[in-house]
């Protein structure tokens, strides 16, 4: 805090308030009688900036120039020092240092609407740290001038509050801006324009669109626009794309045909304006409109695949699986599924519409050649029925391919790698890898995957609905006409060892070997595709190494027998269960003793 | 933004001496630099004296040793004595008022008042 200057005056020049690198000087001088007691030559006055000395001078004035002061306000006090007493505060000064405006930049005037006012925008350019008084001037034709005024440290923008009438509409106007502050001032160049130049129109309005004859083929967008609107661009894209497409439309009086929308898609519409070819600015986008197509008939065929299983001597079930259309081929909400199951000797047939799955099981005779025939339906039609006609589709083994295998690919996806079948492969149409999840009861509930390949391919890579640890079981068909042949294999696409082994629920004797059942592991304990078993036994409280017996695993299996325990002694077995990455755990431990005679 | 009132103009012979008056009101706090300008017709407007809030002066040459300003910070009141008053001394009187505002100074301006000096 500067106290009052009861014991001198500062003087500052030119003034408290200067421009950045200029001088200031500054004069510090005592009173009468208010210099230290005895005579002046003791007086020895000291200028401080802010807390540190950097000028005195013995007498009753002190004069100082001083340079190189930094933006902003910087404290000047003047102290007296007398012989044995401490410094006297004499008077203080703030001084100011900022910039003169630097000359506005890239002034533009933009009027929005017909019936919108003139405003104008400019860069200020380096900041004063000074009131700055902006000053625009507008100059018109028959000498009119309006003038406006913003007297602000920020001021970047005025409204001179006019509107420009059309009239005229290739009458220049003038615009300037001048800045002003206590250090100096500076005006921008002049900007030169017409009412064409600088009328932005308003956005377009209440926008519509209609499909006459719910048709996405005849399509009509409409909009309201200004009076003196020549141009419109028209830009839409489907709602889930980030891509736009773009139209430049002349004379459009608020009416356009659009000829590619897509069926059943949801779009987003946006119009700009703009009132001259080549003057003036475009308006801001419109609101958005934002309207679905009507939907066509699907196009495509369904994908459909399908699995036989025996029931007994007279029957088999059928079990029919389709994939979805995609989007552009369902081309609207898929209502049903239409099933056609005809015997194509006795012209039977039966259909069903199938609404909510993409599968269906049936039960039909064993006898007869049978076909089926697959259509998806929307409001507006169906699609074209994918036939098939019900084979064996393992029956022929000369078409059955070769050597097949399977290989994890990085995360989950497996690679299936086969070679053509012995018969001449060229006979190959195509090829089906299909794959579900291993349950040991062959459960026929197990979701069904498939994909197709061309005859010239012998690998595929399957990557839908594939989980780490988890054991597929795949086959690789070849079809040929009416004929078809399989190999099949297991897969995983990630494994490790099991958590757990084979729970042993029975050991029974038959004629002197045992007979050791077991309980699988569940699914979720495997870890990828089991390989062996093996059962340990070793004599009970004995600390020799156990015995084993390695079984190769098969899906069906869940008991083995053993041949080489002596009778009469105590056994204790267990088993584990081994992938391609290790061996479980233990599973649980088993005693046995045999009572059949020694050998 | 502070409101400026400024008194105390009128018509004086040359050789006669007056006191101008103006005082801040509204938000007056931080008020670091009061100033006195002058606008003589046709001409620009001119820094005549100057006052810090600590007290340190600044004079124009052309007044120096015949005006002197003073403040008084408590009640936001600053004063020009003039004396010794020449016919070129004739304007309008503009009190201003600098305020911090940040790091930037934020001006204020009075409405004016004459002051016409006879020979």
């Known amino acids: 805090k500067i106290d009052a200057c009861k014991r001198g005056d500062v003087t500052v020049k030119p003034s408290h308030v200067i421009l950045l690198g200029s001088t200031v000087n500054i004069t510090c001088s005592l009173k009468p009688r208010q210099g230290c007691f005895h005579y002046s030559r003791r007086n020895k006055l000291i200028l401080y900036k802010f807390d540190r000395r950097i000028n005195f001078h013995h007498g009753h004035s002190l004069n100082s120039q001083v340079t190189g002061l930094p933006l902003g306000t910087t404290l000047f006090v003047c102290k007296l020092a007398c012989i044995n007493s401490d410094e006297i505060q004499i008077c203080g000064a703030e001084i100011f240092v900022g910039v003169a405006p630097e000359q506005p930049q890239n002034l533009s005037c933009i009027q929005k609407g017909e019936q919108g006012t003139v405003a104008c925008t400019w860069e200020r350019g380096r900041d004063t740290h000074l009131y700055t008084e902006y000053t625009l001037q507008l100059s018109g034709p028959k000498n009119l001038t309006w003038q406006k005024q913003c007297k602000d440290i920020y001021c970047d923008y005025l409204d001179f509050g006019i509107n420009l009438t059309p009239e005229s509409p290739e009458s220049n106007f003038t615009a300037k801006v001048t800045a002003v502050n206590s250090l100096g001032s500076s005006s921008s160049l002049p900007s030169t324009f017409t009412f064409l130049d600088i009328v932005r129109p308003l956005p377009p309005w209440d926008i519509r669109i209609k499909f006459q004859k719910a048709s996405v083929s005849r399509c009509t967008l409409y909009w309201r626009d200004e009076g003196l609107v020549l141009l419109n661009r028209l830009r839409y894209r489907p709602s889930n794309s980030r891509l736009w497409n773009m139209v430049n439309v002349t004379k459009a009086k608020g009416r356009h045909d659009l000829l590619d929308l897509k069926p059943f898609t949801e779009y987003e519409f946006q119009i700009s304006s703009k009132l001259h070819l080549y003057k003036g600015s475009w308006s801001d986008w419109s609101e958005s409109l934002r309207a679905q197509t009507p939907e066509e008939e699907p196009t495509g065929m369904l994908d459909v695949w399908y699995m036989k299983r025996h029931i007994d001597y007279s029957r088999q079930q059928i079990s029919l699986f389709w994939k979805n259309l995609s989007v552009s081929e369902a081309r609207g909400k898929i209502l049903h599924y239409q099933v056609t199951l005809q015997e194509l000797t006795g012209g039977k047939a039966m259909t069903q519409n199938i609404t909510g799955h993409t599968s269906w099981t049936t039960v039909i005779p064993r006898t007869g050649n049978w076909a089926v025939a697959v259509s998806a339906a929307n409001s507006k039609g169906s699609s074209l029925p994918t036939r098939i006609n019900i084979m064996n589709l393992c029956e022929a083994g000369l078409l059955a391919p070769r050597q097949v295998s399977a290989n994890s690919e990085g995360m989950d996806n497996i690679l299936v790698t086969w070679q053509p079948p012995r018969k001449d492969p060229s006979a190959v149409q195509e090829y089906v890898v299909e794959w579900r999840e291993l349950h040991p009861g062959g459960d026929t509930q197990v979701p069904l995957n498939w994909l197709r390949s061309r005859p010239y391919n012998v690998s595929a890579l399957i990557s839908e609905n594939i989980k780490s640890y988890i054991c597929y079981e795949i086959r690789v068909y070849a079809l040929s006409g009416d004929q078809g042949g399989c190999s099949s294999i297991l897969g995983n696409s990630k494994h490790k060892a099991p958590l757990s082994g084979p729970h042993i629920n029975a050991i029974t004797e038959e004629k002197g070997s045992i007979l050791i059942s077991w309980n699988s592991i569940p699914v979720q304990e495997q870890m990828g595709c089991l390989l062996h078993y093996r059962i340990y036994w070793k004599e009970r409280d004995s600390n020799s190494q156990p015995q084993l017996c390695e079984i190769p695993y098969r899906v069906s299996q869940n008991s083995h027998p053993i041949n080489s325990l002596q009778p009469r002694v105590t056994y204790v077995l267990w088993m584990t269960a081994l992938t391609a990455a290790g061996e479980s755990s233990h599973g649980n431990e088993r005693e046995f003793c045999l009572q059949g005679k020694a050998n | 933004q502070v409101q400026l009132q400024e008194s105390g103009g009128g018509l004086v012979q040359a050789g006669g001496s007056l006191v101008l008056s103006c005082a801040a009101s509204g938000s007056a706090a931080l008020i670091f630099l009061m100033s006195w300008y002058r606008q003589a017709p046709g001409k620009q407007r001119e820094l005549v004296a100057e006052v810090s809030r600590g007290g340190s002066t600044t004079y124009a040459d052309s007044v120096e040793g015949r005006f002197t300003i003073s403040r008084d910070n408590a009640k936001n009141i600053v004063d020009l004595q003039m004396n010794s008053l020449k016919p070129e001394d004739t304007a309008v009187y503009y009190c201003?008022?600098?305020?911090?505002?940040?790091?930037?100074?934020?001006?204020?301006w009075g409405q004016g008042t004459q002051v016409t000096v006879s020979s």
């Open positions: 201003k008022a600098d305020q911090n505002y940040g790091d930037s100074l934020r001006s204020s």
